[in-house]
Interface confidence: low
């Protein structure tokens, strides 16, 4: 027995709608039948039906066909929503363009080539002949429209309305020149439905002859429509599963847009200094990833190999090594050089802010009466008169209220790192503006500092190198884990606070980090009964270049024998030179047999201008850092202690007065270590830990 | 190749996260999934992360264990182990999606052994 | 969704035949969407079977997978002495807009 073929892929769907007669003379046709597949077949066929089937409805509740001789596009009809109804329009009847000869173009095109109005099929005037709608069924000689009713070259045609021309073929473009799509089409929605060899595409909701997986249910945003072609899974261009049993899938010829232009919809914004969402637009030439490795060039298959090649992902700039984010990553990463590091993101490229035009302030910006009300991160500013009660919770003075206007970015509190604003949102209720210090202003906003002069210099990770082993009173240190592994250090200032750098967190996704604390082994061996794992709710990135991050924690650590907090010196203050200061962490230490334990090598403080000749001058220190040499040749930070504190004792009291961050070489003689000066940050973190809220315990 | 890591001994309510570290496989192309066999016992699906980066999980999985890659690995984490929870975790490749239907897991790492105990 | 192996354990004498049978409580949607698995002890499991009856690239021929809806066999002829191991058949079923993953509780082979 001959298998009847399935010709429900001839038919659009458009799920949950109905269409309903509005002119009472247009016919229809129900009848009780257990699935869709049947009234596709009876319509197809015309079988017992008093019209040519255009559409139909399949009324899944009832399990009831209607039959329609119009469609969505006819007169007299509109469509309506109904949960238990799925239009199927026939594709023959809507397409604009053709397949091959055009034999099955059923569109309404009427125009010759060259312009001529069509002769109606049923007329013989001007020109007489035989093709009759009654001799052609199923041929759709309806109207004037261009037909091919023999499948002739040259596609459909009709006779003209002008004596002097008989018959003429109508400018109807093929399908696959009228589709088109932009890279490897993976955003392509386009109605192409047959494979590069002609084979009708399977209907994605369907399972026969293929069995697969791409449901259009399980993938709402794929755009499984129909048996249109799609690249759901990155391949080279779109494709389907055909309608050939010995033909699993297929690849279609869809060619690629003239101007190579997407949608807006489709096209991230391109930026080249800083990341926009997940970076999908970056087009920078950072090319080392968060800790300073390099990255391999994308063209490149040593020392990794790889099928992100510019050839496989057009589009997406895949040049030179620079970092990418070719494939929906949570930012821009790269292949690295290292054989032993095969990935890394580049979670240095800053997120970008809003940069206003030309707007900028003096000094610490108190005085900026300019009209930006939104923060760094985009929110948009909340009135200052909403905000009146918060701000006197912190400052000690009557601010100046005629400088807060509406909800344009402020600084009434004297904040050291320029204007800021309200957010209204609970999580971050207020945040800095993204304006810059004008040019050419020199003003220092903290006094006693040698140059206020900024530094570029940054080299590679850090980690306390032969250093000695410690257990004493270190219960503020904290081991920074990422997806379990120790990443960098920090230090806990308060039950629900941390202080490291915001090179810590090459992920934006929180639930990759955690936070052990009470612990000596880095791996936590031993320390059982003191560790305590904490769970990362909020970062709270440092004013711009501080390069410091406040890290919540998911609830308070509890303050015991093994976890204490570690205070933070007085906003501006100076340490003399030569006092005697700490770094700790628990990175690679120089030693083959490396044990884990955490580590502390002494160092001095040294003023900024003698820090900066034993740099032999090519680093001048601004008034965000502070300088510490070693005692012993060879020892001071280097890979993986990041975020780590630089602790100094003044007049009995341990502070953190420095942070450990991607600074200027390894434990290398003569050549003192420049940490983050958290003395220059104080106010910073004093205000954060006041305004934001935390877990209660 | 899929290799497992991560297992280790860990007290309840520690969280713990494993990596599946792949090499030679293209997860833009594949899907991942997470099976568990408790000592002695049967093979337990776990749930799977797709080219997309979509993740399914079994019903019982759900809000305890989270799926999630990078373009070489795939993490599993549990957030808040009990000892039930013991067992050896294998990372698995499943069959490329457009030669079958079926979710058949035909490449596995050697597993990587969760001890949850106080 | 429940997948229930029998017997377990069954043995079989070199050069015989094993029949192992996998009831499902619930039929499978797209009724083949099934798979068949063998684990050695301190082994990771090896594919068997796919699509029901389709044998995974390098299995020798002597496995065959057979059945539909509920009920799934998977026969070993000519049965060896490195064909002793547990046997897991392995279904998927629809829950959601998901598909969720069903293994049986596995069925010992000892070869005499």
């Known amino acids: 027995q001959r298998k009847r073929r399935n010709t429900i892929h001839e038919f659009k769907k458009s799920a949950k709608t109905t269409l309903i007669k509005i002119d009472p003379a247009l016919k229809i046709k129900t009848k009780k039948v257990n699935t869709a597949d049947q009234c596709a077949n009876r319509c197809t066929r015309n079988k017992g039906l008093p019209f040519t089937c255009k559409a139909f409805v399949f009324d899944k509740a009832r399990k009831q066909c209607l039959w329609f001789p119009f469609n969505s596009m006819s007169s007299g009809v509109k469509k309506e929503f109904g949960h238990e109804f799925d239009l199927y329009e026939n594709k023959d009847y809507i397409r604009n363009c053709i397949i091959g000869k055009g034999r099955s173009y059923k569109g309404t095109v009427s125009i010759t080539k060259s312009g001529i109005k069509c002769q109606p099929w049923s007329s013989m005037i001007p020109h007489e002949h035989s093709f009759l709608p009654s001799s052609y069924r199923g041929k759709d000689l309806q109207e004037n429209y261009c037909r091919n009713p023999r499948g002739e070259e040259g596609g459909p045609w009709c006779f003209t309305s002008n004596p002097e021309v008989r018959y003429e073929v109508c400018d109807i473009p093929q399908c696959s020149e009228v589709e088109c799509m932009t890279c490897n089409g993976e955003s392509y929605r386009g109605l192409m439905d047959h494979t590069e060899s002609g084979k009708i595409c399977q209907r994605w909701d369907h399972q026969t002859p293929h069995r697969h997986k791409f449901l259009p249910e399980r993938y709402p945003d794929k755009g499984f429509d129909d048996n249109y072609c799609r690249n759901p899974d990155g391949q080279p261009r779109p494709w389907c599963y055909t309608l050939d049993p010995h033909t699993r899938w297929e690849y279609c010829a869809i060619k690629t847009c003239a101007d190579n232009t997407m949608n807006d919809t489709d096209v991230p914004l391109e930026t080249t200094e800083c990341i926009q969402g997940q970076g999908e637009g970056y087009r920078g030439t950072v090319n080392t990833i968060w800790n300073g490795i390099p990255c391999q060039r994308w063209d490149s298959q040593y020392p990794h190999e790889h099928d992100m090649t510019p050839e496989n992902f057009k589009c997406k700039d895949l040049r030179e090594n620079y970092c990418r984010n070719p494939d929906g990553s949570e930012s821009p990463w790269c292949f690295t050089t290292d054989p032993n590091i095969r990935v890394g993101y580049c979670s240095q490229i800053p997120n970008c802010d809003m940069s206003h035009g030309q707007d900028c302030y003096r000094g610490n910006g108190k005085n900026y009466m300019g009209n930006l009300s939104q923060t760094r991160s985009g929110l948009t500013c909340s009135m200052w008169d909403k905000n009146m009660e918060d701000l006197h919770r912190h400052i000690f003075w009557e601010p100046d209220a005629s400088k807060l206007n509406e909800n344009y970015c402020r600084n009434p509190d004297d904040d050291a790192h320029g204007p800021w604003c309200y957010t209204g949102n609970p999580l971050i209720p207020w945040d800095y503006c993204p304006i810059s210090r004008c040019e050419g202003d020199t003003t220092p906003t903290i006094v006693n500092l040698d140059h206020p002069v900024i530094s570029c210099a940054k080299t590679k990770q850090l980690r306390v190198v032969n250093g000695i082993p410690t257990r004493t009173n270190i219960g503020w240190m904290v081991s920074l884990r990422y997806r379990n592994k120790h990443i960098c250090g920090g230090s806990l200032i308060k039950e629900s606070w941390v202080l490291t750098a915001r090179q810590c967190f090459p992920s934006r996704d929180l639930k990759d980090y955690e936070a052990w604390l009470g612990i000596h082994d880095v791996h936590g061996r031993g320390d059982e009964k003191c560790k305590q794992v904490l769970n990362v709710s909020q970062l709270v990135y440092g004013p711009e270049g501080s390069d410091l991050v406040l890290m919540k924690l998911a609830r308070p650590a509890v303050l015991d024998d093994f976890v204490s907090t570690i205070d933070l010196p007085n906003y501006g203050c100076t340490i003399p030179e030569k006092t005697s200061c700490s770094v700790y962490g628990w990175g690679y230490t120089g030693l083959i047999n490396y044990d884990g334990l955490l580590r502390v090598a002494h160092l001095y403080i040294m003023g900024n201008e003698k820090c900066s000749q034993h740099h032999r001058g090519k680093v001048t220190l601004n008034e965000s850092e502070i300088c510490a040499g070693a005692e012993k040749i060879g020892s001071g930070p280097c890979e993986g202690d990041y975020g780590g504190p630089l602790v100094c004792e003044q007049h009995k009291m341990r502070m953190v007065l420095g942070v450990i961050v991607p600074g200027r070489g390894c434990a290398i003689p003569n050549r003192p270590g420049i940490f983050v000066r958290v003395a220059y940050y104080a106010k910073w973190i004093h205000k954060i830990i006041l305004t934001y809220k935390v877990p209660q315990s | 190749s899929v290799e497992e890591s991560g297992g280790r001994l860990v007290p309840p309510g520690t969280p713990l996260t494993l990596t599946c570290t792949v090499s030679g496989i293209d997860l833009s192309s594949y899907a991942m999934g997470w099976v568990r066999q408790a000592p002695g016992k049967g093979l337990e699906y776990i749930g799977m992360?797709?080219?997309?980066?979509s993740t399914y999980y079994a019903d019982w999985a759900k809000g305890r264990l989270t799926i999630s890659k990078t373009p070489t690995t795939v993490d599993l984490e549990i957030t808040s182990p009990t000892t039930e929870d013991t067992a050896t975790y294998f990372c698995a490749r499943l069959i490329d999606e457009r030669s079958t239907y079926s979710y058949a897991f035909d490449l596995w790492g050697q597993g990587t052994l969760v001890t949850v105990s106080s | 969704q429940v997948l229930t192996q029998t017997p377990s354990p069954v043995s079989a004498a070199v050069g015989g035949t094993v029949t192992i049978n996998c009831q499902a409580s619930q039929s499978f949607y797209n009724n083949g969407a099934f798979s068949w698995y063998q684990q050695k002890p301190g082994q990771p499991p090896k594919l068997l079977i796919y699509?029901?009856?389709t044998l995974a690239s390098g299995v020798p021929s002597r496995f065959k997978g057979s059945g539909s809806g509920t009920q799934f066999t998977l026969t070993i002829s000519g049965v060896q002495c490195g064909d002793a191991a547990t046997y897991y058949c392995q279904g998927e079923f629809s829950c959601g807009s998901a598909d969720c993953v069903a293994f049986g509780g596995g069925t010992e082979v000892v070869v005499k």
């Open positions: 699509d029901a009856s």
């Open positions: 992360i797709d080219v997309s980066g």
